[in-house]
Every structure is written in structure tokens, then in C-alpha cells.
């Protein structure tokens, strides 16, 4: 049994890091393998992660972490029974994938303005709380070409757009994702999408 693709890990910079790897053949990850991880710190203890299958030869493990600070470094040991298959390390702050924003809501009762709001996925005491920026994706269910991205580079988790920038009388969907420039993170997954019917009063033409 050998590792074909070494584990690569990403952290949500809060409580979970996810590691994925590939074996050289079909493997029952949960019965044959264990991923041991330990924070390089005086008070820490080793923890064991039981991997799950992720495709035939692929495995994935969700490492639970109490808390994350930028200096943290973890040792990783992948075992098959008594055999050490791979040894490595992982610095969560260098491989951050933020959590997806939640509670995306479209408020359509503000005159002819659409107000989209969502929740920051981090608690206020987490470093990323004040460092997230967002991308909002709005698209038409009827017209695949009607697809747009709004970059929200301020901290407030909201976006205002004129209803008239979208077509009237049709349904739209929106979703939002996050990233943090400070840690050069990847983008988060998209939030679940929300749907609304766009309608607004056409302004009277002046002749």
C-alpha cells in the first residue's frame, strides 16, 4: 500500500482542516488508514483522524482544531496499521479556505433597490471576521447569459443594487462567497442560493 498523491490540507481558520490524498489503488480509508496530527506546542497531544473514502483511491480527513493562530504548525503522520506511509507538516494560516457565508437574504421592499444581506461565517473574536471580502453572483434562471458578479470589497456583508439593473418580471438567484486578502486565501464555497422574482416600476418616458 502506497500514497500516490500526498495529503494536501486546507483550514477554515476556525475549527476544521480538511486533508485529501490518493492511494495507489482502491482503499477502504476508514478501516485501513489513520491520520495522526499534533500541534507543535508544549501542551498539545496527538489526535487521530479516521479518513473517509473520496472516490475509489481517494481519502479525505476532517481534522478538528480547538482554535487557530497564525504561528500554528501541525505534524501529520499517515499510518496503515503499524506502517508509516507518509510524514509531513501543515501550517493552517498558509492554506486557508474560508467558511461559506450564510443566511443570504434578498430584501425587495426597499423602493426600487435590491438589498442583499448575508452573515459573516466567523465569530467576532476570529481574526478573519474583520478581513473578509465577498463576491456576489446573480443570475437569471431563464437566461444563462444573464450572469453577473459583484465584488464587495468593504467589510459590511451587504450589497445594494438598483432593481432596474436586472430584467423585470423574471426570477433571479443569488449566492455569495468569501475570501481574505490578508492570508491570500482561496475562495470559500458558494453559499446556498436564494431566489426572488424581480419586478420594478418602469419609469415613465418623458416626451
Amino acid at each position: 500500500m502506497k500514497v500516490l498523491q500526498e495529503p494536501t490540507c486546507v483550514s477554515d481558520y476556525m475549527s476544521i482542516s480538511t486533508c485529501e490524498w490518493k492511494m495507489n489503488g482502491p482503499t477502504n480509508c476508514s478501516t485501513e488508514l489513520r491520520l495522526l496530527y499534533q500541534l507543535v506546542f508544549l501542551l498539545s497531544e496527538a489526535h487521530t483522524c479516521i479518513p473517509e473514502n473520496n472516490g475509489g483511491a481517494g481519502c479525505v480527513c476532517h481534522l478538528l482544531m480547538d482554535d487557530v493562530v497564525s504561528a500554528d504548525n501541525y505534524t501529520l503522520d499517515l499510518w496503515a496499521g503499524q506502517q508509516l506511509l507518509w510524514k509531513g507538516s501543515f501550517k493552517p494560516s498558509e492554506h486557508v479556505k474560508p467558511r461559506a457565508p450564510g443566511n443570504l437574504t434578498v430584501h425587495t421592499n426597499v423602493s426600487d433597490t435590491l438589498l442583499l444581506t448575508w452573515s459573516n461565517p466567523y465569530p467576532p473574536d476570529n481574526y478573519l471576521y474583520n478581513h473578509l471580502t465577498y463576491a456576489v453572483n446573480i443570475w437569471s434562471e431563464n437566461d444563462p447569459a444573464d450572469f453577473r458578479i459583484y465584488n464587495v470589497t468593504y467589510l459590511e456583508p451587504s450589497l445594494r443594487i438598483a432593481a432596474s439593473t436586472l430584467k423585470s418580471g423574471i426570477s433571479y438567484r443569488a449566492r455569495v462567497r468569501a475570501w481574505a486578502q490578508c492570508y491570500n486565501t482561496t475562495w470559500s464555497e458558494w453559499s446556498p442560493s436564494t431566489k426572488w422574482h424581480n419586478s420594478y416600476r418602469e419609469p415613465f418616458e418623458q416626451h
Epitope: 500541534l39 507543535v40 506546542f41 508544549l42 501542551l43 498539545s44 480547538d66 482554535d67 493562530v69 497564525s70 504561528a71 500554528d72 504548525n73
Partner: antibody, heavy 120, light 106 residues
Framework: DVQLQQSGPELLKPGASVKIPCQAS????????MDWVKQSHGKNLEWIGN????????FYNQKFKGKATLTVDKSSSTAYMELRSLTSEDTAVYYC?????????????WGQGTSVTVSS | QIVLSQSPAILSASPGEKVTMTCRAS?????IHWYQQKPGSSPKPWIY???NLASGVPVRFSGSGSGTSYSLTISRVEAEDAATYYC?????????FGGGTKLEIK
């Protein structure tokens, strides 16, 4: 509100022992370690050791092994440090502090300190 | 054990000035914490794990560094910042403290 309450000053003779209490309130006592720190001459700080109130596990600075013994009473949320065979070198202010893994050993709350004076 | 050397021992600054104090370790460490202490009081939690401000610490304070060299910076000193600042390492047993930098305000 998190509070760590320590006892008042102690004046002791060489060779004596003293047991300093640190009563915790405002948080779940077993969720954090209790660390102890010595401050001599109002300046030098030395880490003595810590105890995990959940399982009673202790972690000492080698220098204080045999000098300090750390214990807890979970029922009263109180940590204790006993110092034995006291000498003038033990004259100092002793602090308890809430620590642990979560903030990488950082003591985020401190007691007000207990002054121990050893004199014949 | 790891020896932490803080410099300068005494730092004198005028209100509004930017000041930096350093903490050098005798060998490489990962986690450095900082505490503030005023005469007659317990040390106060100030900065943890190199750069994270403890609750209630003004944002004019910041921490940085890696390896053997760490620093605490105050962007604009205020009179209330007069105190002694201690660094502490939590990477090698036993955890050790520096000798402190006393900040005086002119």
C-alpha cells in the same frame, strides 16, 4: 465576569510550608489550565507549572519540582499551590493565571497575587 | 532553557510617538506572548501568539516577529501606556519570561 481570587500575604519562617489558594469564578473551571508564576523583587517572572483541573495532570518547570505541588478541588473551583521547605529565596509574589492550549499557553486572567515573605 | 532578552531595558517616549520594543530568544521559538504590568498590580494579558491583541487592548498596539526576534509596537504612545512589558515564550519547556522593558512617558 472571570475572576481568580487569591489569599492575603503570608509571613513565614524558614523551613515552613504554605498552601496558597486560587478560587476561580465566572467560567467552567475544568475547561482551562491553572498556571502559577513567581515574581521576585517586583521584576523577574518565572513560570512554576500548571495543572489541568479536568484530570489533575500537572506540568512543572524542573526548577520547581520538589518545591511546589499543584492540586485542585473541583467542587470549590479552587486551585492550590503548596510551597515547602521555604527559604529566603522563596520570598516573592505568587500569581495564579488561567491558561491552556486554546491560546497557546497565554494567561488571559490573573489573580491579584499572594505575597510570601520568608524571614527568621 | 530559552533565554528571552528584552531591549531596551528602559524606553522613554513622548505622547504621540511611535515606539518599538524587542524580545530576542536564545533559540528559535514559535509562540511569544506579551503582558503589561503597572506597579502594585498583577500582569495584564496584552498580546498572545505573536500578534493577537487580548480583549480590551487598544489597537495602537501590535505584535510581530518570528524565529528568534519579536517586537511589540505602539503606533502612538499615550500616558496610560506607561508600564513594564514582559514577553513570554511557550515553545520549549520551561516557558520563560523576558526581563521586561519599562516604558516611561516624558
Amino acid at each position: 465576569d472571570v475572576q481568580l481570587q487569591q489569599s492575603g500575604p503570608e509571613l513565614l519562617k524558614p523551613g515552613a510550608s504554605v498552601k496558597i489558594p486560587c478560587q476561580a469564578s465566572g467560567y467552567t473551571f475544568t475547561d482551562y489550565n491553572m498556571d502559577w508564576v513567581k515574581q521576585s523583587h517586583g521584576k523577574n517572572l518565572e513560570w512554576i507549572g500548571n495543572i489541568n483541573p479536568n484530570n489533575g495532570g500537572t506540568f512543572y518547570n524542573q526548577k520547581f519540582k520538589g518545591k511546589a505541588t499543584l492540586t485542585v478541588d473541583k467542587s470549590s473551583s479552587t486551585a492550590y499551590m503548596e510551597l515547602r521547605s521555604l527559604t529566603s529565596e522563596d520570598t516573592a509574589v505568587y500569581y495564579c493565571g488561567r491558561g491552556g492550549l486554546r491560546r497557546r499557553g497565554f494567561l488571559d486572567y490573573w489573580g491579584q497575587g499572594t505575597s510570601v515573605t520568608v524571614s527568621s | 532553557q530559552i533565554v528571552l532578552s528584552q531591549s531596551p531595558a528602559i524606553l522613554s517616549a513622548s505622547p504621540g510617538e511611535k515606539v518599538t520594543m524587542t524580545c530576542r530568544a536564545s533559540s528559535s521559538v514559535i509562540y511569544i506572548h506579551w503582558y503589561q504590568q503597572k506597579p502594585g498590580s498583577s500582569p495584564k494579558p496584552w498580546i498572545y501568539a505573536v500578534s493577537n491583541l487580548a480583549s480590551g487592548v487598544p489597537v495602537r498596539f501590535s505584535g510581530s516577529g518570528s524565529g528568534t526576534s519579536y517586537s511589540l509596537t505602539i503606533s502612538r504612545v499615550e500616558a496610560e501606556d506607561a508600564a513594564t512589558y514582559y514577553c513570554q515564550q511557550w515553545s520549549v519547556n520551561p516557558p520563560t519570561f523576558g526581563g521586561g522593558t519599562k516604558l516611561e512617558i516624558k
